[in-house]
């Protein structure tokens, strides 16, 4: 038994055919000590007297709010709830599994940006007598706050005879640091109470695979003279992180008719325009997605190709480009060749997600993700990495940076990968271990040397840990990457010459 | 299944124009863009233009253009491609294609080889 | 016009091996970049489209990477009927072009 809140109570129960249940004693929260009577919810039949009560728990009857008397006079309350664990797996009965995406996901979190805020929501057939309530942290063993709000309930749909009910909540974190690379992972757990049965569910992740921009706005159409083609063009969405030059999105662009079936036209790009074929009664549409990181795209922003005019959606700046002043050229170092450091840099995003694509879909947090790959160099918040710290002194990032890939470059060189089972040269793995050095020697010319970080050794010894492990290394790349992208594209398009 | 049959073997002299057909089956006609991708002897492929069956669109690479038109005739689901002023260098062999995406090509015909000499 | 540029022109491997193709575009076309695969006397067959997206009915040895200017295909594990020409082509605007191709040779 444990204390959820103040005077409710948690009984947790193997739930099976005659088992014995708990023995639970409640003390009566009072000074007094004779004449003390207990009763169960709204029933007047005394159950025991004194000031503790023992009973044992078996099943839900046992459960609700016990309540200790003196003389008619209401002493305390304890609330007892039940948590059934069925076969070793706690019940999961309140929550609908939303099997996406996969199963056993009962909440799923999105966030529009990478400023710490996110929204979680879950679905239920319930709808009386619940309540959840949200707690959140980055990490688990040393955490650091996030806050929540009140869960609310945010739909409600009919699904066949069924009515469907979604809650959402928003948590921010509260020392966020958008433009770091997350080491820990979010934590979210919801407790849920519907009657006097008690569930808890949590989520683990990171606010960079969550991501999923809102559409692109104010999508505007140009007709081109003597041609069937249209420019159109758009804006990156007011919730985007900012500046989009650190912060950048890729785009797709689609002619559909109203039917999925019919012809289509699809392009995708970098810019915040592209041309495209219009036909009469299709529509144009532009979806974003994060340019370094394989994220969720965004839903669709659409325009009909007959209107030329604008969609819904205000003014704002789009593009990539960065604003404000030029950077100023790097004390105490030369500035490095950020255009082609750019260049190698998204290739390296490329690779990184094509080495093992089914990285981004597995779920390794439960393989014990912080004792393998907590030795892994991290872009932390203190790294000067952000687009204030690269206009300050930019050295101190591309130190970092140099040392990220350097250390990669020796892991993806070492047994992990080079043992069983064997991967050849020229695998998207070979190719990228020859880009993470190419990009290191890009920041680190002959003669000018900074300290390099200890590989660690991690030498698995059967081939499926070796495999374990790289999918590992391999997603910890891929957000590296991502963050060293976003600086050097940051760099081209402010501190260049 | 969806299938492009083209038009025999074309032998031309410099100067003529020459007319390929390309004759689609196993799906709606208007639902796909028809491509023409020609092929020189031993060389690479060149995209030539697109056609919209369902209203006549048309699009063609700059190198073609005043020199191409493409046609279709929906109740036989037959796709034309005219080439005029040959020249001994439009000696290729000529394939139509057929996408619902417009800017790749995902069914081929068989190709009409088309010779030009005089 | 956006120019394609395939490397090597041939490519001699021996049947097993892994065989990594090239293209590379004359400015950034994001990753529109299709893969194509012709053998002698026959009309060309799309492998990959949109640089990584498979196609089905086609063996998975057959993979396509690469974003911006620089692009891949890698036959993982070449079989007897893989020797033929592939061809990558630019769909990020009119006109469309593809490049020289790349022949692929048994050693």
């Known amino acids: 038994i444990w204390e959820l809140k103040k005077d409710v109570y948690v009984v947790e129960l193997d739930w099976y055919p005659d088992a014995p249940g708990e023995m639970v004693v409640l003390t009566c929260d009072t000074p007094e000590e004779d004449g003390i009577t207990w009763t169960l919810d709204q029933s007047s039949e005394v159950l025991g007297s004194g000031k503790t009560l023992t009973i044992q728990v078996k099943e839900f009857g046992d459960a609700g709010q016990y309540t200790c008397h003196k003389g008619g006079e209401v002493l305390s309350h304890s609330l007892l709830l039940l948590h059934k664990k069925e076969d070793g797996i706690w019940s999961t009965d309140i929550l609908k599994d939303q099997k996406e995406p996969k199963n056993k996901t009962f909440l799923r979190c999105e966030a529009k940006n990478y400023s710490g805020r996110f929204t979680c929501w879950w679905l239920t057939t319930i709808s009386t007598d619940l309540t959840f309530s949200v707690k959140s942290s980055r990490g688990s063993s040393d955490p650091q706050g996030v806050t929540c709000g009140a869960a609310t309930l945010s739909a409600e749909r009919v699904r066949g005879d069924n009515k469907e009910y979604e809650y959402s909540v928003e948590c921010q974190e509260d020392s966020a640091c958008p433009a770091a690379e997350e080491s820990l992972p979010i934590e979210v757990m919801v407790d849920a109470v519907h009657k006097l049965k008690y569930e808890n569910y949590t989520s683990s992740f990171f606010i960079r695979d969550i991501i999923k921009p809102d559409p692109p706005k104010n999508l505007q159409l140009k007709p081109l003279k003597n041609s069937r083609q249209v420019e159109v063009s758009w804006e990156y969405p007011d919730t985007w992180s900012t500046p989009h030059s650190y912060f950048s999105l890729t785009f797709c662009v689609q002619v559909q008719g109203k039917s999925k079936r019919e012809k289509a036209d699809r392009v995708f790009t970098d810019k915040t325009s592209a041309t495209v074929i219009c036909r009469k009664n299709a529509s144009i549409s532009v979806r974003a997605q994060d340019r370094y990181y394989s994220s969720s795209w965004s839903e669709w922003a659409s325009v009909p190709c007959s209107g030329s005019g604008s969609s819904r959606g205000g003014s704002g700046s789009g593009g990539s480009g960065g604003g404000g002043s030029k950077l100023r050229a790097v004390p105490g170092g030369s500035s490095p060749a950020w255009t082609q450091c750019q260049q190698l840099s998204q290739k390296l995003c490329t690779l990184a997600w094509s080495a093992h694509p089914l990285v981004g879909h597995m779920d390794l947090r439960e393989e014990g993700d912080e004792e393998t790959t907590n030795d892994v160099p991290h872009i932390q918040c203190g790294d000067g990495c952000d687009p204030q710290g690269l206009r300050d002194n930019s050295q101190f990032c591309l130190q970092r940076i140099h040392q990220g890939l350097i250390f990669y470059e020796k892991l993806l060189g070492s047994d992990i990968f080079t043992g069983e089972p064997s991967l050849l040269p020229d695998s998207p793995v070979g190719q990228l271990h020859a880009s993470l050095l190419g990009l290191s020697q890009l920041l680190q010319p002959e003669g000018h040397h900074w300290e390099t970080q200890q590989i660690p050794s991690l030498s698995p010894s059967q081939p499926w840990q070796r495999l374990l492990l790289r999918f590992k290394i391999l997603r910890s790349l891929q957000a590296f990457v991502a963050v060293a992208a976003r600086v050097f594209a940051h760099g081209a398009a402010t501190l260049s010459p | 299944q969806v299938q492009l049959v083209q038009s025999g073997a074309e032998v031309k002299k410099p100067g003529a124009s020459v007319k390929v057909s390309c004759k689609a089956s196993?799906?709606?006609?208007?639902?796909?863009?028809l491509h023409w991708v020609r092929q020189a002897p031993g060389q690479g492929l060149e995209w030539m233009g697109w056609i919209d069956p369902e209203n006549g669109d048309t699009e063609y690479a700059p190198k073609f253009q005043g020199r191409v038109t493409m046609t279709t005739d929906t109740s036989t689901s037959t796709a034309y491609m005219e080439l005029r002023s040959l020249r001994s260098d439009d000696t290729a062999v000529y394939y139509c294609n057929a996408n619902k995406e417009l800017r790749y090509f995902d069914v081929w015909g068989q190709g009409t080889m088309v010779t030009v000499s005089s | 016009e956006i120019v394609m540029t395939q490397s090597p022109a041939t490519l001699s491997v021996s049947p097993g091996e892994r065989a990594t193709l090239s293209c590379r575009a004359s400015q950034s076309i994001s990753i529109n970049l299709h893969w194509y695969q012709q053998k002698p006397g026959q009309a060309p067959r799309l492998l990959i489209y949109f640089a990584s997206q498979s196609i089905s009915g086609i063996p998975a040895r057959f993979s396509g990477s690469g974003s911006g200017t620089e692009f891949t295909l890698t036959i993982s594990s070449l079989q007897s009927e893989d020797f033929a020409v592939y061809y990558c082509q630019q769909s990020n605007s009119f006109p469309l072009t593809f490049g020289g191709g790349t022949k692929v040779e048994i050693k």
């Open positions: 196993g799906y709606t006609f208007t639902d796909y863009y």
